[in-house]
Amino acid sequence: TQHGIRLPLRSGLGGAPLGLRLPRETDEEPEEPGRRGSFVEMVDNLRGKSGQGYYVEMTVGSPPQTLNILVDTGSSNFAVGAAPHPFLHRYYQRQLSSTYRDLRKGVYVPYTQGKWEGELGTDLVSIPHGPNVTVRANIAAITESDKFFINGSNWEGILGLAYAEIARPDDSLEPFFDSLVKQTHVPNLFSLQLCGAGFPLNQSEVLASVGGSMIIGGIDHSLYTGSLWYTPIRREWYYEVIIVRVEINGQDLKMDCKEYNYDKSIVDSGTTNLRLPKKVFEAAVKSIKAASSTEKFPDGFWLGEQLVCWQAGTTPWNIFPVISLYLMGEVTNQSFRITILPQQYLRPVEDVATSQDDCYKFAISQSSTGTVMGAVIMEGFYVVFDRARKRIGFAVSACHVHDEFRTAAVEGPFVTLDMEDCGYNIPQTDESTLMT
């Protein structure tokens, strides 16, 4: 997964308190026993801080050592700090675990900026606010790293939830979720509700705040409104999907749909931004600038570098357009669209101006590795990673940040022809995707 720019992202207080959830828009799909319903023990099990990742509490070893682990659908290794580091409050101490087994193998993971390396082993792992099971899983004990851990982020490791094909050092290293499903009766599915704060949080607020939910093995009704719409997982490596159309305030970008997926489109909880291929990014920014032309902002803002501030409570959300991504549907020639608000793609930033200001970074950026639907997208939706049926579901999140005029939306069906042509076929010779 692409650290540096990628990791990690923002979380915080839910946009809508429990008592203020949006009304259910449509009837539910039929029940699937064991897969749907209430997962009370897992609701609100994620925490996080603006731009620095959503993490879940996990225990490793015997006796259990508690660690906060970043939830990352853009990688496939379970890796934890296993040596002292200035940014870590605690780390995995293998020598204290009676159930640790050394695999006598190293692992080295480089990123564009930074890297981590460590030693492979296995140990017993559980998730206190997850299913009541313990599994023996592969663990990369990180012994050395550069620009990987983030000062003040409060997480000590990473849980890669994608497929074995992108595991390091190779696809023979079974990812955690595969081990979980193999060793238990947990269904092969998980779902994420990431709740962006909509406003910056200071450290004390973060420690007491809700960041969202990771429901392991099921779908929780209370976390979304309306219907779930599913898009096929194109290939089981990253969570790869196909975007067939992009609109800014309802205006089609009118690009060859292959451009939207060049060289892939993935759903990645470990990336903060919505990242778009160069041509798509340029067209999208041009369109967003045109839609918001009553005010002008410096180039550095559109590059995600400069912050723009407004007096607290006066952010002009209405001048910024909504962005719709149309995804391939499950039925031939059928698509659906997910629509995000500026409340998702303008990321609140703390501690830069005065307390009288609300300051934001533009959280859409350019990519050389395809589209990455990071937190900016995911914070608008409840996202179901239905691995069993090779599909990803989207519904409007009950905690997404919105205003009285607009909300995020998941709508369909739409007729879209030749959607298969929108996928890009990566040449088999070039799959060193982490070095991006």
């Epitope: 009553t294 005010e295 410096p298 550095g300 803002f301 400069q306 501030c309 830069v352 300051c359």
Partner: antibody, heavy 120, light 108 residues
């Protein structure tokens, strides 16, 4: 070449409203490449940004002055104006109008400034 | 709030000498920093933008460097007309609002 010129009374009584106008000559205030700004400097002290306006009328104000400041634009006269209400002696300063250029980032052209004294 | 601290407050030098002025930000402002020169009774004049780019018409003896939190304005060889007050300003947070307190360069 483009020039900026501030005008308005040099003396304002406490509790009254300070009103200044900046006239843009040698170019159009409606150029989309610029914001137009007010900055002040109390005698012997540093610079304080007051606010910006775009030709569309969109404004940004210094949070510490926001409750008292109004900046407006008159494209037909190629002017923009500052009103600062409920003034006190602490508002005595040289008031500059300036152009925010270089991609809306930097004050690249300034008026000569006008001293406004608040005194009864 | 980002605070810009300029040092020294006063720099006493002779014509022909090299002047080095410092501006430190309380947190990173990337390269979004400008330097201004102000002579008595005059408006400030933009010298340097984006930390190191000379504004139009500014002599080559003026140069800016730095990024993040530490910035420097260097005048390689002081001319008589360079004795003035110099201000830095950050625009990482937009709209631009924060100026440093100034450094006075005076004749020794």
């Amino acid at each position: 070449q483009l020039q900026l010129q501030e005008s308005g009374p040099g003396l304002v009584k406490p509790s009254e409203t300070l009103s200044l106008t900046c006239t843009v000559s040698g170019g159009s205030i409606s150029w989309s490449s610029y914001y137009w700004s007010w900055i002040r400097q109390p005698p012997g002290k540093g610079l304080e940004w007051i606010g910006n306006i775009y030709y569309s009328g969109s404004t940004y104000y210094n949070p510490s002055l926001k409750s008292r400041v109004t900046i407006s634009v008159d494209t037909s006269k190629n002017q923009f104006s500052l009103k600062l209400s409920s003034v006190t002696a602490a508002d005595t300063a040289v008031y500059y109008c300036a152009r925010l250029g270089h991609g809306y980032n930097y004050f690249d052209l300034w008026g000569r400034g006008t001293l406004v004294t608040v005194s009864s | 709030e980002i605070v810009l601290t300029q040092s020294p407050a006063t720099l006493s030098l002779s014509p022909g000498e090299r002047a080095t002025l410092s501006c430190r930000a309380s947190q990173s402002v990337s390269s979004y920093l400008a330097w201004f020169q102000q002579k008595p009774g005059q408006a400030p004049r933009l010298l340097i933008y984006d930390a190191s780019n000379r504004a139009t018409g500014i002599p080559a003896r003026f140069s800016g460097s730095g990024s993040g939190t530490d910035f420097t304005l260097t005048i390689s060889s002081l001319e008589p007309e360079d004795f003035a007050v110099y201000y830095c300003q950050q625009v990482y947070v937009w709209p631009p609002r924060t100026f440093g307190g100034g450094t006075k360069v005076e004749i020794k």
